[in-house]
């Protein structure tokens, strides 16, 4: 056969679908690899061909589009399963070709089993809600194109294993789930089950996402430096190890780039002839506020080092702050020598 532009196996499209549910999979060629869409390709006389390689097999084989009830079908650039079976797992290839042109890409499809509480190996999308921020909604994802707008599906929402009804601050509203005031207790997995009829059959779509309640932008503040502070003095003798922690609290701010750094006499430690090491650790609170600690360490401090200015800086999308550490040389304790003077006075 003639040369074909092979885009390889596109693992970015690691598609996971639930067993015994409908699945519609668009050929990734038109979304990510080619500069034209399916309609343009079709009107230019190009044909879209599908084939697959079963799990743990090397042999490419055509997809059987003659199964009972049209279980697998193709419509334009979409491959349909109505519904999926476990052994549909494999690598699927869509190829666009005519006599002079050929382009193809493969992608993995994994058919996943779920238990009665919707637990499965499915990778779950995460939706962040701001804590105590007013009404916020999540929408049942990836259900577009499964049924026409004339069809009115029934939607049931679950938190974990429990159907959401008469919950205090969570209200199902069709495809949306409204959180009147999000709290930490709302963290968890939420599932919508969409049920719709098609050609005398009933299909279910199950979609689960993780809700994570995070700090609200209303409460966000510039970074707060907890250490160094005015209450702690780093008093050292030459030859001792100097350790100064810089501990900074950052409010959660979506996508903010948080950073902490030290300057010594206004310069980066690298720009000074001094043997400094800096170790960093990062921790997060339940609402994803961040605490960064950077420990500045000088193994054997000199008297010159103890005269330098050590400043911790922090910056986030909310602002920038800096704080100097109080460093001083320990004054040696006076040595008391007892002098006994014996005086003999003659009168």
């Amino acid at each position: 056969s003639e040369r074909c532009d092979d885009w390889g196996l596109d693992t970015m499209r690691q598609i996971q679908v639930f067993e015994d549910e409908p699945a519609r999979i668009k050929c990734p060629l038109f979304e990510h690899f080619l500069k034209f869409n399916y309609s343009t390709a079709h009107s230019a006389g190009l044909t879209l061909i599908w084939y697959w390689t079963r799990q743990d097999r090397d042999l490419e084989e055509p997809i059987n589009f003659r199964l009972p009830e049209n279980r697998i079908s193709k419509e334009k650039d979409v491959l349909w399963f109505r519904p999926t079976l476990l052994n549909d797992t494999g690598n699927y290839t869509c190829m666009l070709r005519n006599t002079t042109y050929c382009s193809k890409v493969a992608f993995p499809l994994e058919v996943v089993q779920k238990d009665s509480c919707f637990n499965s190996p499915m990778k779950l999308p995460v939706h962040k809600l701001y804590i105590e921020y007013g009404i916020q909604r999540i929408t049942c994802p990836n259900v577009d194109g499964y049924f026409p707008s004339s069809v009115k599906p029934t939607i049931t929402w679950y938190m974990g294993c429990y159907k959401i009804q008469n919950f205090n601050n969570v209200i199902p509203e069709g495809m949306n789930l409204s959180f009147l005031i999000a709290l930490i207790s709302n963290n968890g997995n939420y599932t919508c089950v969409v049920t719709y009829p098609e050609n005398g059959r009933t299909f279910h779509l199950t979609r689960t996402l993780t809700v994570k309640v995070v700090g609200s932008p209303k409460n966000a503040v510039p970074p707060v430096i907890h250490s160094p502070n005015d209450h702690v003095v780093y008093e050292k003798e030459p030859g001792e190890e100097l350790l100064i922690p810089c501990t900074v609290y950052f409010s959660f701010l979506m996508d903010s780039r948080n950073e902490v750094w030290w300057t010594i006499d206004g310069k980066k430690p690298d720009d000074i002839t001094i043997d400094v090491t800096i170790n960093e650790s990062i921790s997060h609170s339940r609402t994803e506020d961040e605490t960064r600690t950077q420990i500045l360490s000088i193994k054997k401090v000199t008297s010159e080092d103890l005269k330098r200015s050590y400043v911790c800086h922090a910056r986030s999308a909310k602002g920038e702050v800096a704080k100097a550490a109080k460093v001083k040389q320990k004054v040696p304790a006076p040595r008391y020598t007892v002098e006994l003077a014996c005086g003999f006075g003659a009168t």
Epitope: R257, W261, K268, P269, D270, T277, I278, H313, R315
Partner: antibody, heavy 111, light 106 residues
């Protein structure tokens, strides 16, 4: 080492640093397309425990560092023709700009 | 994500002329950084934290701006200033660059 890769293939870039305290710097990879557009690809914290990626490479590329050997890596998988670019490793101290850029390594993705 | 739009994309100036190029951010950011690149070389830091000149950058360069509007100015264009200038933001992930302004010598 850059080079040529087929679509869907893999490649590993490395960058060796010298002349500065490697662990003091946040390291990044930035690429420049043939059309000369600059695009940030990934960033790694000083200790290596925190990584950040651009949406275009999330799930396909992995940034890592070996502080003992002053080395930065970019493992590229499922590469596409859009990944064709000159890849630069860069360093940044604190929240400041990328104050030094490597000489770059060329990556071409083509079947 | 923050989109940085640089204008003009290409400009030319005569020696001694004043040059201003701009960088507009789609949302408010804390600072902008500028890089300069000459053909066949890596980008070099040029102006950091909006207005600070990197070491070795001539005093005829200056940077200013805040929020969503930033600019780089050369008060006296010289032949060696012909290059491409990129703006860059590191306030939010993903970090982003402008499309560049190519400055040519007239």
């Amino acid at each position: 080492g850059g080079g040529l890769a087929k679509p869907g293939g893999s490649l590993k870039l490395s960058c060796t640093a010298s002349g500065f305290t490697f662990t003091s710097y946040v390291m990044s990879w930035v690429r420049q397309s043939p059309e000369k557009r600059l695009e940030w690809v990934a960033e790694i914290s000083r200790g290596g425990s925190h990584t950040y990626y651009s949406d275009t490479v999330t799930g396909r590329f992995t940034i890592s560092r070996d502080n003992a050997n002053n080395a930065l890596y970019l493992e590229m998988s499922s590469v596409r023709s859009a990944d064709t670019a000159m890849y630069f490793c860069t360093r940044a101290y604190g929240n400041s700009e990328m104050d030094f850029w490597g000489q770059g390594t060329s990556v071409t993705v083509s079947s | 994500q923050i989109v940085l739009t640089q204008s003009p994309a290409i400009m030319s100036a005569s020696p001694g002329e004043k040059v201003t190029m701009t960088c507009s951010a789609s949302s408010s950011i804390s600072y902008i950084h500028w890089y300069r690149q000459k053909p066949g070389t890596s980008p070099k830091r040029w102006i950091y934290d909006t207005s600070n000149l990197a070491s070795g950058v001539p005093a005829r360069f200056s940077g200013s701006g805040s929020g969503t509007s930033y600019s780089l100015t050369i008060i006296n264009m010289e032949a060696e200033d012909a290059a491409t200038y990129y703006c860059h933001q590191r306030t939010y992930y993903p970090l982003t660059f402008g499309g560049g302004t190519r400055l040519e010598l007239k």
